[in-house]
């Protein structure tokens, strides 16, 4: 048993052009939180499959409001580690998905809204009990910097947290073949059932049924000495009592090689022989090969035959990213109608609709004319998430149910008097004006500005507006 620990160092715009827009704004403040999902690394599982090793959610980060005009900085992060406890052995190779989520804190109906900002993924080799491993992953224009480690929970120890520690039975030393439990030097490894016949003095095991030899011994049961000399290290000052050369401090003391690397001395320094999946001077860099199966979602891995050569994932349709862990930005096609906000959740697209619209793509207008009648001969006109009635003459109001006063707007020009009429309004024009709204002056010579007065009407007569 043990705990996988993840420390997020920064989340912000990556290098290069095309800095991302800040996820928060003065109108819509937000805060970040993170989710980590762990799976045994050699299993071929899609990004959406269960987190077999465990998952954890961070606390919410501080509320952030964008400064207008400023570039998106590294965003404020939640405090503390993300911890994923594991009950069984640590698998050594694991896959991870780290998601950055945004919680919008504006006036949301029904509470805050969450949306996925970025998702990174990878497969790594990691020995429990080792140092923090640092990593940088990019998701689109965003960059996530983080460290991680796996540590065993007492009494478990070892690279897989399968060895057990127990308090010492004797105050001075541990029993044959058992070592002190670093860092708990006052405890000893509990004996495991090693391979039958494994030397109790010169052999030990980290897994049941194996037999690993202490320095100076070899063979399947650690019964064959490497050298007949009892002095195994020809270095350092001579010991007068034994005649042996007692080892002095060397560059490999304390084993500077991380992640299970083995140290060998060179004339000037030391050299680490790294296990598969790690490289660097001290095996501190985790390198992933195609054998580790780094491509998610059915991606095809090419190259990367050894840890020093890069692998490339050729992704199937709909997926992208260095590990095929990200879905293509389907929202760029703007599938949401009527101003709806598009959210690509991976397994599905979601549209957050504006008020007045509904449906999976905001295609239903809740305020449309369907089922709505405009009274008194009015006609319904849709638009902008609302409906309105274009009313027949003499009626007004939202549904044309109110009798309109046609004279309220003072439609008669030049001092004409307005009279309401069943079919509209009538203007009685002041002397010198004519027309339906008294808009035309009568010329002094008696000729109208109109080509001709309609038959039966003399200038100055009331003009009925039909």
């Amino acid at each position: 048993a043990g705990v996988f620990e993840l420390q997020i160092h920064s989340f912000g715009p990556g290098p290069g052009p095309g800095a991302p827009r800040s996820p928060c704004s003065a109108r819509l403040p937000c805060r970040l939180f993170f989710r980590v999902c762990l799976k045994p690394g050699l299993s071929e599982e899609a990004a959406e499959s269960p987190c077999a090793l465990g998952a954890a959610l961070s606390a919410r980060g501080p509320v952030y409001t964008e400064q207008p005009g400023a570039p998106a900085p590294d965003l404020p992060l939640p405090d503390g580690l993300l911890q994923v406890p594991f009950r069984d052995a640590w698998p050594g190779t694991f896959s991870f998905i780290i998601e950055t989520w945004r919680e919008e804190l504006g006036d949301q109906i029904g509470g805050p809204a969450w949306s996925l900002l970025a998702r990174v993924a990878g497969r790594r080799r990691l020995a429990a009990g080792g140092p923090w491993a640092r990593d940088i992953q990019r998701a689109g224009a965003w960059e996530l910097r983080f460290s991680y480690r796996a540590r065993c929970e007492p009494p478990a120890v070892g690279t897989a947290c399968t060895r057990l520690c127990r308090p010492r039975s004797a105050p001075s030393r541990c029993g044959p073949g058992l070592r002190p439990c670093a860092p708990l030097e006052d405890e000893c490894e509990a004996p495991l059932v090693c391979r039958a016949g494994c030397s109790p003095e010169h052999g030990f095991c980290e897994q049941p049924g194996e037999c690993r030899c202490l320095e100076g011994w070899t063979g399947p049961l650690c019964t064959v000495p490497v050298s007949t000399s009892s002095c195994l290290s020809p270095r350092g000052p001579s010991s007068a009592t034994t005649g042996c050369l007692v080892p002095g401090p060397g560059p490999c003391d304390g084993n500077p090689c991380a992640n299970g690397g083995s140290c060998s001395e060179t004339p000037r320094s030391f050299e680490c022989t790294c296990p598969r999946g790690f490289y660097g001077l001290r095996c501190e860099v985790s390198g992933v090969t195609c054998a580790d199966g780094p491509c998610f979602n059915g991606g095809l891995c090419v190259g990367g035959a050894d840890p020093d050569s890069a692998y490339i994932c050729h992704c199937p349709p709909g997926f992208q990213g260095s590990n095929c862990e990200k879905r293509v930005d389907r929202c760029s096609l703007q599938p949401c109608r009527n101003g709806g906000l598009c959210l690509d959740l991976g397994h599905a697209l979601r549209c957050r609709c504006r008020a007045g619209f509904a449906g999976p793509r905001c295609e239903h207008d809740l305020d449309d004319c369907a089922g709505r009648a405009c009274a008194n001969g009015g006609t319904c006109v849709e638009g902008g998430g609302a409906h309105r009635c274009s009313c027949a003459l003499g009626f007004g109001g939202r549904d044309c149910r109110e009798r309109a006063d046609p004279c309220a707007a003072r439609p008669c020009a030049h001092g004409g008097r307005c009279y309401a009429h069943f079919s509209g309004l009538v203007c009685a024009c002041a002397p010198g004006y004519m027309g339906a709204r008294c808009e035309f002056p009568v010329h002094p010579d008696g000729a109208s500005a109109l080509p001709a007065a309609p038959p039966g009407l003399r200038p100055g007569d009331p003009q009925r507006y039909l």
Epitope: R330, Q334, P335, N338, E363
Partner: nanobody, 120 residues
């Protein structure tokens, strides 16, 4: 299930033209949005051109004035007319469609892709 079948890809010289077609078939109630994405080696897939859910046309900045998207609603088909092709247009072009399979169920579908190579 909905199928998208692309055609029209091929090799062309810089400055040349190609016309891509994408036909949707299967249990289609209506097509909400439909368009073309492309993926060049080592680059992320990007939208080239498409008809949005609101029926508007949308183009990537890099293809405006050179590419034209059109559709035949009766045939559930979209076309991408590509002119003045450049080496940087070399990519696998994928058709994408957001399709209502009934009044209240909508899903996203991808075609298998068609390769467009622009080289002298």
């Amino acid at each position: 299930e909905v199928q998208l079948v692309e055609s029209g890809g091929g090799e062309v010289q810089p400055g040349g033209s190609l016309r891509l077609s994408c036909a949707a078939s299967g249990s289609i109630f209506s097509i909400n949005a439909m368009g073309w994405y492309r993926e060049a080696p080592g680059k992320q897939r990007e939208l080239v051109a498409g008809f949005t859910g609101d029926g508007m046309t949308k183009y990537a900045e890099s293809v405006k004035g050179r590419f034209t998207i059109s559709r035949d609603n009766a045939k559930n088909t979209v076309y991408l007319q590509m002119s003045s092709l450049r080496a940087e247009d070399t990519a696998v072009y994928y058709c994408a469609a957001d399709v209502f399979t009934d009044r209240d169920h909508v899903d996203w579908y991808w075609g298998q892709g068609t390769l467009v190579t622009v080289k002298p």
